[in-house]
């Protein structure tokens, strides 16, 4: 059965300066390949977090993604600004050169409220 990417919240609201968690779980780790978070869709989408590297200011993984059985790829965005508003997608890739996108979550829209 094909891997499914589950983003349970359709939207979240967060006050500017606060933190928010964007939830994402997978039904399987197979086929092997990275998981990445993007804001937006298409060619102009912006990479927000990749579980293959650790250098993303303000964005951290919520669970221990180094567990070999980990299926939780939720992220926390800290010190949210109005520019962070948008729809965030958790995306599963199959390994390759380059990696191939095989499944995306339904997206979580982030609304940023004035403080």
């Amino acid at each position: 059965t094909e891997v499914k990417v589950i983003q349970p919240e359709k939207s979240v609201s967060v006050a500017a300066g606060d933190s928010t968690v964007l939830n994402c779980t997978l039904t399987s780790l197979l086929p092997v390949g990275p998981i990445r978070w993007y804001r937006g869709v298409g060619q102009s989408r912006q990479l927000i977090y990749s579980f293959t590297t650790e250098h993303f200011p303000r964005v951290t993984n919520v669970s221990d993604a180094t567990k070999r059985s980990n299926l939780d790829f939720s992220i926390r965005i800290s010190n949210v600004t109005p520019e962070d508003a948008g729809t965030y997608y958790c995306v599963k890739f199959q390994r390759g050169s380059p990696d191939t996108e095989i499944q995306s979550g339904g997206g979580t829209e982030v609304y940023v409220l004035a403080k």
Partner: antibody
């Protein structure tokens, strides 16, 4: 620079125990899974055990399950391997290695030699 | 089990390919590890099929397809003489394995 330095090796008798340590520096130790790999004289590499970054999940090859225990202390930037009921077949150089995001290895220690002999 | 040739040889400047078979492309990632003498610390030359650490020369490259991985050394040098181990991580079993090693001789 990433550095991994193993210690605790030596000569022990069959049936005895030994605890290996690996001191890590040059990276955020608490963010990385780690593993132990050994190499018997004249043989190839053999993965023994791995541990998640937080230390809650451990994994072992069948031949050491129940005898060896991998653990870590993130406050001390240290990885450990407790080895019990040692046999001559456990004679090897033991390496600690840092895992990549997909559980391969990017950095290795210099190794520590364990000799099990009567 | 991972299978790789016991030995390969080449002249300086030639291209060397070392293959490693036995993994499942659906569930397995490959890496390559260089060991210049028995008991010395291995050095990772490729991880994640084709990713080269920043301190490894660009003449080393890796690829994977089907049930096999390949390490390619383009323009081999005398200092590349070593044993090369392929390694794999299987996402089904959560287990790492290694091949028996390939001895590269540069003539």
């Amino acid at each position: 620079d990433v550095q991994l330095v193993e210690s605790g090796g030596g000569v022990v008798r069959p049936g005895e125990s030994l605890r290996l340590s690996c001191a890590a520096s040059g990276f955020t130790f608490s963010s990385y899974a780690m593993s132990w790999v050994r190499q018997a004289p004249g043989k190839g590499l053999e993965w023994l055990a791995g541990i998640s970054a937080g230390g809650s999940d451990t994994y072992y090859i069948d031949s050491v399950k129940g005898r060896f225990t991998i653990s870590r202390d993130n406050s001390k930037n240290s990885l450990y391997l407790q080895m019990n009921s040692l046999t001559a077949e456990d004679t090897a150089v033991y390496y600690c290695a840092r895992e990549t995001w997909n559980h391969l290895f990017d950095y290795w220690g210099l190794g520590t030699l364990v000799t099990v002999s009567s | 089990a991972l299978t790789q040739p016991a030995s390969v040889s080449a002249n300086p400047g030639e291209t060397v390919k070392i293959t490693c078979s036995g993994g499942d492309y659906y569930s397995t990632y490959y890496g390559w590890y260089q060991q210049k003498s028995p008991g010395s610390a291995p050095v990772t030359v490729i991880h994640s099929d084709d990713k080269r650490p920043s301190d490894i020369p660009s003449r080393f490259s890796g690829s994977a397809s089907g049930s096999a991985a390949t390490l390619t050394i383009t323009g081999v040098r005398v200092e590349d003489e070593a044993v090369y181990f392929c390694g794999a991580y299987d996402g089904r079993t959560y287990i790492n394995t290694f091949g028996a090693g390939t001895t590269l001789t540069v003539l």
